[in-house]
């Protein structure tokens, strides 16, 4: 015998209280596949989330982050404050990258400049807080282990939330 619920399309649920007929999902709920016995509650976009896609009877709402924040995790499960290029997020807020490190994005951490000498090259363009160094061909009389700034990796305590 075929399960009568298998005939219920996406956007409906198989209503046990009404002889297993297919009922439309109630407001603020959805079913993305057929044959469902319940509809799922739509995701709400509150706090620093904003609605990227409204919920429909067949698909969940999607959230992204309000300006000044970016998404973390699958499906934008959390938001994190943006910083400027040349900064990283610490527990005390956005801080400039230490000398010898850079960040070319509004998120993430400051990373050490490339050590050109490790590849037998010299520094063609100096690094900044926002940009990595550009390595060029080795200069005459180059001996490995010179012609490069190698700063210590910065100690970090990432993370800060707007209060």
């Amino acid at each position: 015998l075929q399960d009568p619920c298998s005939n219920c399309p996406a956007g409906t649920f198989c209503d046990n209280n009404r002889n297993q007929i297919c009922s439309p999902c109630p407001p603020n709920s959805f079913s993305s596949a057929g044959g469902q016995r319940t509809c799922d509650i739509c995701r709400q976009c509150k706090g620093v989330f904003r609605t990227r896609k409204e919920c429909s009877s067949t698909s969940n709402a999607e959230c992204d982050c309000t300006p000044g924040f970016h998404c973390l995790g699958a499906g934008c499960s959390m938001c994190e404050q943006d910083c400027k290029q040349g900064q990283e997020l610490t527990k005390k807020g956005c801080k400039d990258c230490c000398f010898g490190t850079f960040n070319d994005q509004k998120r993430g951490i400051c990373r050490p400049w490339t050590n050109c000498s490790l590849d037998g090259k010299s520094v063609l363009v100096n690094g900044t807080k926002e940009r990595d160094v550009v390595c060029g061909p080795a200069s005459a009389g180059f001996s490995p282990g010179t012609s490069s700034v190698t700063p210590p990796a910065p100690a970090r305590e990432p993370g800060h939330s707007p209060q």
């Epitope: 995701r43 924040f69 973390l72 499960s77 994190e80 527990k91």
Partner: antibody, heavy 119, light 107 residues
Framework: QVQLVQSGAEVKKPGSSVKVSCKAS????????ISWVRQAPGQGLEWMGG????????NYAQKFQGRVTITADESTSTAYMELSSLRSEDTAVYYC????????????WGQGTLVTVSS | DIELTQPPSVSVAPGQTARISCSGD??????ASWYQQKPGQAPVLVIY???NRPSGIPERFSGSNSGNTATLTISGTQAEDEADYYC??????????FGGGTKLTVL
Amino acid sequence: QVQLVQSGAEVKKPGSSVKVSCKASGGTFNSYAISWVRQAPGQGLEWMGGIIPGFGTANYAQKFQGRVTITADESTSTAYMELSSLRSEDTAVYYCARKNEEDGGFDHWGQGTLVTVSS
Amino acid sequence: DIELTQPPSVSVAPGQTARISCSGDNLGDYYASWYQQKPGQAPVLVIYDDSNRPSGIPERFSGSNSGNTATLTISGTQAEDEADYYCQTWDGTLHFVFGGGTKLTVL
């Protein structure tokens, strides 16, 4: 089945530090936020801070800033909470808790670790 | 930080409806969760995102959140529901706040 298993009870002297661990099993570790919540005897729950292991992002409640450090080791699926400059008021049960992926609820909790601060 | 205020205690007769409130500035703009905690045990999530029930939580538990108040409602309260209940809010970032807790007594 997700499980959070915490390290054992600790007795500490005032002024010292304590580091409590929370090992996760049975689920993806790096994409879920792990929070630390404490409860002093007869008192309520207090959120201390949290971390998203896969992003290295940590954040702390204002009350604990500068005294708490939360870290995570993805290779062992373990989160850590270190509290320094301990005082008697820090005597409490410390819980780790995992945030559900897309919502704000802590759906899994560790068993709790009692930290006693006494001279 | 938003501050969450709960009544210290609520009493209810068995079979009746218990309502536990949680108030804070514009709380309805944020996500509210509720936890049940029995003596000597870790808290258990009973409501998340204002009104959603995790699997395994009885249907008698429901939640709402609008304006400045979130409410946990337990209809047909049973003796086993006697516990401490905590509200919690989340703004979407890695930041959470708990209310002070409410002791529910089933008379």
